[in-house]
């Protein structure tokens, strides 16, 4: 079951999935000036079973000039942003699939992909929060949110995180110093999390985010 809502907004924080539950969809979208190849996939899907999951299909983009189905509307500001080259060059950390049954790792980048990835999360997905650059965690309960189904409706649990404006950046679970595990989280759970280095921190995300359905993407 897909989650109808976005994960909660935390001022001065952004979130990240460490791994994606089976059933998660990732839109195959291309950056400005590019389109999917003819007969290309609309989305990637995390498929499999409890023992092994992987992304089905591949996203492929081609120059709009080579296709005549290219009616480009005026791009929104977020479409015009360029990915940091360091993001694209940063290698993914390996994932032990066996320790994450029913989950997929972060898909590798594809050539000319859109600036921001749009995921469709499913019930049971967990995302982790981090204070943005320039803020640190003042209060730290579980800095995570889970999409749950209650009374036939999906909802995200509220993460216990407050970010305060001091020049110190809190870390994602798995990015802590080796000797420190996240409060309230068993070491075994921490150790099976994916660590990726290509996550784009959107410093403007939480505090100014509109509540419109059509405003922002999962990131």
């Amino acid at each position: 079951e897909l989650c109808d809502d976005d994960p909660p907004e935390i001022p001065h924080a952004t979130f990240k999935a460490m791994a994606y539950k089976e059933g998660t969809m990732l839109n195959c979208e291309c950056k400005r000036g590019f389109r999917r190849i003819k007969s290309g996939s609309l989305y990637m899907l995390c498929t499999g079973n409890s023992s092994h999951s992987s992304w089905d299909n591949q996203c492929q983009c081609t120059s709009s000039a080579t296709r005549n189905t290219t009616k480009q509307v005026t791009p929104q500001p977020e479409e015009q942003k360029e990915r940091k080259t360091t993001e694209m060059q940063s290698p993914m950390q390996p994932v032990d699939q066996a320790s994450l049954p029913g989950h997929c790792r972060e898909p590798p980048p594809w050539e000319n992909e859109a600036t921001e990835r749009i995921y469709h999360f499913v019930v049971g997905q967990m995302v982790y929060y981090q204070c943005v650059q320039g803020y640190r965690a003042l209060h730290r309960g579980p800095a995570e949110s889970v999409c749950k189904m209650t009374h036939g409706k999906t909802r995200w649990t509220q993460p216990q995180l407050i970010c305060t404006g001091e020049m110190e950046t809190s870390q994602f679970p798995g990015e802590e110093k080796p000797q420190a595990s996240p409060e309230g989280r068993p070491e075994s759970e921490t150790s099976c999390l994916v660590t990726t280095t290509d996550f784009q921190i959107q410093t403007e995300m939480a505090a100014t985010m509109e509540t419109s359905i059509f405003t922002t993407e999962y990131q």
Partner: antibody, heavy 115, light 107 residues
């Protein structure tokens, strides 16, 4: 409850244009596409294209590239499809649908092209 | 484009019957097959996605199966409210394409 609301009918003359709406409610996810699908009387369903409302990113069925233009207004959570240079072949019911699985559909807008 | 074919354009059945509607793709669609129900008033609902997954709120008498190019929708215990036209769709290759529909009627 997820809903996609469409006006019931639109009338237009041959050669004119028509712009129909699809207002989304009942969900706050920003990740969903809005697709548009055409159904001629007594016939099957044809995919026209989709828009990612948050970015304006569009994909079209090549057959409808010169016929349809998809847009969206984020402030009102509404997607639009404009059909131009209308002919009798454009008389049909037009549906909007949500997401990769087309999991929720509007009631459809009946477009009648007649002089 | 991938062609989706529903060879049976209409079929008649009785209440309580087990009904199977088939759909064939012109090439392997790797289980990206969805089923929709269109009621006589035009209302369209998703029933099954990704070949066999039941959409939220859909009665369990509906089920889907298949692989490669051949897929089917089964209604295990036909009810009056199931009178409708059923469309298959391959949903993950541009452009998404629909079958011509199978109209289900009561005997």
């Amino acid at each position: 409850q997820v809903q996609l609301q469409q006006p019931g009918a639109e009338m237009a003359k041959p050669g004119a244009s028509v712009k129909m709406s699809c207002k989304a409610s009942g969900y706050t996810s920003t990740a969903y596409w809005i697709h548009w699908v055409k159904q001629r009387p007594g016939q099957g369903l044809e995919w026209i294209g989709y828009i990612t409302p948050s970015t304006g990113y569009t994909e079209y069925n090549q057959k409808f590239e010169d016929k349809a233009t998809l847009t969206a207004d984020k402030s009102s959570n509404t997607a639009y499809m404009q059909l131009n240079s209308l002919t009798s072949e454009d008389s049909a019911v037009y549906y909007c649908a949500r997401g990769g699985y087309f999991d929720y559909w509007g009631q459809g807008t009946t477009v009648t092209v007649s002089s | 484009d991938i062609q989706m074919t529903q060879t049976t354009s209409s079929l008649s059945a009785s209440l309580g019957d087990r009904v199977t509607i088939s759909c064939r793709a012109s090439q392997d669609i790797s289980n990206y097959l969805n089923w929709y129900q269109q009621k006589p008033d035009g209302t369209v609902k998703l029933l099954i996605y990704y070949t066999s997954r039941l959409h939220s709120g859909v009665p369990s008498r509906f089920s889907g199966s298949g692989s490669g190019t051949d897929y089917s929708l089964t209604i295990s215990n036909l009810e009056q409210e199931d009178i409708a036209t059923y469309f298959c769709q391959q949903g993950n290759t541009l452009p998404p394409t629909f079958g011509g529909g199978t109209k289900l009627e009561m005997k």
